[in-house]
């Protein structure tokens, strides 16, 4: 089950302080109707403290007392019954401690009941287990402010729970949020408490509220929501990747390309080769061999795995990059030992051959060919 | 112990339809959001469909929106998957999954039943 | 859709070796990424949930870590019946992409 965090959460405030959490279940006040109840916050070094009750904001009136770190309820009702939470504002931080009040004729002696679970539902008048709405997972709701990239999915969560099972409904910007208000519309999955948007656009940006009720009470938490315009660029390679690699005869390899691309990239592992016992071609450029590109038939065309490698797999491994915009290439050198000798850790530098200077490559008679660099373009 | 029988499959020529059906115990069903995975003969795990508990919502693969249709009967504690439109592609291994409660993780499935869609 | 992009595609190693894949996404999906072991002929089995939660029932040597685009799973100690393949699963969108598979195998 999991455990009693933040309750109330009603306004955007990204610059807050950090919240601490309380882990284990709340404890458990139990009186009689009738009867006065008096609770000590737990908390030190207390500045300010505020106290709710099933997620509301509570304040003094004519049975309940406010003093210092102290709740004081006089003449307790079955409808005082619920889950209280005091918060301790500091210059830092706050802190939030819960705990449970359960006002039912029906006390037990304690004899005979386990009151490890104390932290269920609370009984009422009428011997039903009744709730009010609670967040039951708080770490999935801290991250308020969502900055999202164009096109990205975003899903927003409010995983709650309370007898009977509240329901859960969503606001943008204050109000009723529809189908229609977005093209593509938004999926909301009721047992996963969570609003998904798919490939979200810059009308998209607001405050998205998650509101959660029922007969005993009401929730509620915003999100904020800013899509971030994609800029188009040719691709970037991660500096230092691929990273030159040494083993021995017989030994595996991989090299590892990162790409960041917003549109759609394609990647192809170049190698040096020789053709005819020349590793350069008429018009002085290198033959260059396609090992691996992306597409339908290449699964994480990203690596490039060389297995039981021979000394004819030595030299240099070229990733290129394009997408509509531009392209990028990056290169590492694969040393290949002898099996007596073990491999040394290779300075990780990222080679640039100058003579990349235009990437049009004459290959169109399948995967493996051997084709000469035709211009080869190289961008820092 | 909960336990995911699948039934249903067998051959059938592109262009055709099956339905599979998925048999649950061990659990309350209706409490469960359920999903539809698959795998080629040879091939990785591609998620197809998942309906919520109460049927509320469902969600398909875009590799196969608008031909398979995923549904429930929860007094019968049975999940569907009606294909139509078949293709030599659809051919795989289809298992039934239940999810997590509040996470899509699927922590029972059945034993897989094989569709070959074959001319 | 969200696609998930997983290295290496397949590695050989010994029983007490170390083992770690990795599993990336395409966009950040916070902590909801699951792993699952498959052994030939059988259905997977739920390994690691929402990043890092070992789901009850799975040995403790396997262990997840990441959030956003970057995640891990952990063998700390491989043992004969961990040779399988390994696959990763997103859950933060509406369609749960899985990764392309992990195999590892016997060295």
């Known amino acids: 089950r999991p455990s009693f965090s933040l309750v109330e959460d009603t306004t955007l405030e990204p610059e807050e302080p950090p919240t601490k959490y309380q882990i284990s279940q709340p404890e458990v006040y139990v009186a009689a109707p009738g009867e006065s109840l008096e609770v000590r916050c737990l908390l030190k070094d207390a500045a300010v403290i505020s106290w709710t009750k099933d997620g509301v904001h509570l304040g003094p009136n004519n049975r309940t007392v406010l003093i210092g770190e102290y709740l004081q309820i006089k003449g307790a009702t079955p409808r005082d019954s619920g889950l209280y939470a005091c918060t301790a504002t500091r210059t830092v931080d706050s802190e939030t401690w819960y705990f449970m009040v359960n006002v039912t004729d029906a006390i037990s002696s304690g004899d005979d009941e386990d009151d490890t679970d104390g932290a269920e539902d609370f009984v009422s008048e009428n011997g039903n287990n009744k709730r009010a709405p609670y967040w039951t997972n708080t770490e999935k709701m801290e991250k308020r402010l969502h900055a999202v990239p164009a096109a990205n999915t975003v899903k927003f969560r409010c995983p709650a729970g309370g007898n009977p099972t509240p329901t859960m409904r969503w606001l943008k910007n204050g109000k009723e949020f529809k189908q229609e208000h977005r093209i593509g519309g938004y999926k909301v999955r009721n047992q996963h408490w969570s609003l998904i948007m798919e490939s979200v656009v810059p009308s998209d940006k607001g405050n998205y509220t998650c509101v959660v009720e029922n007969e005993y009470g009401s929730i509620n938490h915003t999100y904020h929501l800013d899509v971030v315009e994609r800029s188009p660029h040719r691709p970037i390679l991660q500096a230092g990747l691929p990273a030159n690699a040494s083993t021995v005869v017989g030994g595996d390899v991989e090299f590892v390309c990162k790409v960041y691309s917003d549109a759609q990239p394609h990647i192809q592992w170049i190698k040096h080769v020789e053709k005819n016992g020349s590793k350069y071609g008429p018009d002085g450029l290198p033959y260059l061999k396609v090992l691996k590109h992306s597409g339908i038939n290449s699964s994480n065309a990203e690596v490039l795995a060389l297995f039981n490698v021979t000394e004819a797999d030595a030299g240099e491994y070229i990733c290129k990059v394009s997408n509509y915009i531009g392209q990028a290439n990056q290169s590492a050198w694969l040393t290949v030992l002898p099996k007596q000798q073990a491999p040394g850790r290779e300075k990780e530098i990222t080679a640039s051959p100058d003579y990349l200077e235009k990437l049009e490559f004459r290959h169109d008679s399948g995967l493996n060919d051997i084709f000469e660099a035709q211009k080869i373009e190289w961008h820092e | 112990q909960v336990q995911l029988l699948e039934s249903g499959g067998g051959l059938v020529q592109p262009g055709g339809s099956l339905r599979l059906s998925c048999a649950a115990s061990?659990?309350?069903?209706?409490?469960?959001?359920m999903s539809w995975v698959r795998q080629a003969p040879g091939k990785g795990l591609e998620w197809v469909s998942v309906i919520e508990g109460d049927g509320s919502y469902t969600h398909y693969a875009d590799s196969v929106k608008g031909r398979f249709t995923i549904s429930r009967d929860n007094s019968k504690n049975t999940l569907y998957l009606q294909m139509n439109s078949l293709r030599a592609e659809d051919t795989a291994v289809y298992y039934c999954a239940r999810e997590k409660t509040y996470s899509s993780a699927f922590d029972y499935w059945g034993q897989g039943t094989l569709v070959t869609v074959s001319s | 859709d969200i696609q998930m992009t997983q290295s290496p595609s397949s590695l050989s190693a010994s029983v007490g070796d170390r083992v770690t894949i990795t599993c990336r996404a395409s966009q950040d999906i916070s902590s909801d990424l699951n792993w699952y072991q498959q052994k030939p002929g059988k259905a997977p089995k739920l390994l690691i949930y929402?990043?890092?939660n070992l789901q009850s029932g799975v040995p403790s040597r396997f262990s997840g870590s990441g959030s956003g685009t970057d995640f891990t799973l952990t063998i700390s100690s491989l043992q004969p019946e961990d040779f399988a393949v390994y696959y990763c699963q997103q859950h933060y969108s509406p369609s749960h992409t899985f990764g392309q598979g992990t195999k590892v195998e016997i060295k």
């Open positions: 061990g659990f309350t069903f209706s409490d469960y959001a």
């Open positions: 929402d990043a890092s």
